[in-house]
């Protein structure tokens, strides 16, 4: 799979979006989780209703949200008040029994406030060290590694 | 249990080569990025490379490339550190460290270090 | 390359005693920064990854903090186990760098 990064501001909420085949994926719960490494685990953050015929109503876990569009096919979490330790490698998952398909991998990138000017110095600005080398924008708040491209990681 | 297990002391001359071996077990390494981290003797820690043992992948840093080559026989669960046109200053102690990569990797484990010493 | 500046470089301190070690980086690194323990003779020990999460076994009177460019370990109630040497290393970019080291010594 391809990442995905999805840029947000400290503060502020982010709307992530994994779109995905409705017919393939016809009946499946899908999840959110967050992966320790780039091989690590991915450990669950939150996942659509249990009765999937009801997927499109939101469900919180903290300041994380899920909500399915089943028939438009389009798995969308909102990270509400996004703080910098909410940085990090995540994936759209749709569940089948005790299996689990990736629809996308997400990188979270947490932008300073350009109104913020306390923690200024805290948080990274963009235009500065990135973490993907040569990973095209997609359109404003995210952007697409190129095929077989390799993230120019963090490490731990 | 799961552990790195390195070969042992190397002392080599000016010009040659070492070839350092770091053998997973407990795990297998195609699930890992091996690093290579050197030390200096009453130095800090130096960050050499890389690699990705599931597609032979590697990434090198600045200072040491096109002196080092890094690979892994995922078969023997082993990483290889090779450092050629050795010279006085690459006498330090080399270790191989296993960890998921990085964003939050949780996943670290080390080898217990090779000496190599460089001298004429 | 992104250097990582640690200070200080050296400390007393004694048993009991809070002790605060900085590191700052050159360039924003986000949250992607461990803290490592180093005993002479020893590997490192992963303590801190992600400027602020125990690593599994590491006893909870060692925290991190910070993001961005400057992070700080702090060790809440120093045991005689923990005179030793610490590092930063930074995972924004490679290659990886760390900070050039924190001796923790017996006063």
């Known amino acids: 799979h391809n990442t995905t990064v999805f840029q947000g501001v400290a503060g502020q909420s982010l709307q992530v979006s994994c779109p995905y085949d409705s017919m393939k994926h016809w009946g499946r719960r899908k999840a959110w989780c967050r992966q320790l490494g780039e091989k690590g685990p991915c450990q669950r953050v939150v996942s659509t209703h249990n009765l999937w015929l009801l997927s499109f109503l939101r469900r919180w876990n903290g300041s994380t949200a899920i909500t399915d569009d089943t028939l438009g096919g389009t798995l969308t979490i909102t990270l509400r008040n996004l703080q910098p330790h909410d940085a990090g490698l995540y994936q759209c998952q749709s569940l089948h029994g005790s299996e689990a398909d990736t629809l996308r991998k997400v990188l979270v990138e947490v932008l300073a406030d350009p109104l913020d000017h306390r923690d200024a110095g805290d948080l990274w600005f963009p235009g500065e060290s990135e973490s993907f080398e040569d990973a095209h924008v997609e359109h404003s708040i995210s952007r697409s590694l190129l095929e077989g491209e390799i993230p120019f990681p963090p490490t731990s | 249990q799961v552990q790195l297990v390195q070969s042992g002391a190397e002392v080599k001359k000016p010009g040659a080569s070492v070839k350092v071996s770091c053998k997973a077990s407990g795990f297998s390494i195609e699930d890992f990025y091996i690093h290579w981290v050197r030390q200096a003797p009453g130095q800090g820690l130096e960050w050499m490379g890389w690699?990705?043992?599931?597609?032979?992948?590697?990434k090198y840093a600045p200072k040491f490339q096109g002196r080092v080559t890094i690979t892994a026989d995922t078969s023997t669960s082993t990483a290889y550190m090779e450092l050629s046109s050795l010279r006085s200053e690459d006498t330090a102690v080399y270790y191989c460290h296993a960890d998921h990569g990085n964003y939050g990797s949780t996943m670290d484990y080390w080898g217990q270090g090779t000496l190599v010493t460089v001298s004429s | 390359d992104i250097q990582m500046t640690q200070s200080p470089s050296s400390l007393s301190a004694s048993v009991g005693d809070r002790v605060t070690i900085t590191c700052h980086a050159s360039q924003h690194i986000n949250v992607w920064l461990s803290w490592y323990q180093q005993k002479p003779g020893k590997a490192p020990k992963l303590l801190i990854y992600k400027a602020s999460n125990l690593h599994t076994g590491v006893p909870s009177r060692f925290s991190g903090s910070g993001s961005g460019t400057d992070f700080t370990l702090t060790i809440s109630s120093l045991q005689p186990e923990d005179f030793a040497t610490y590092y930063c290393q930074q995972g924004q970019t490679y290659p990886r760098t760390f900070g050039q080291g924190t001796k923790v010594e017996i006063k």
């Open positions: 690699i990705d043992p599931e597609n032979g992948e590697s």
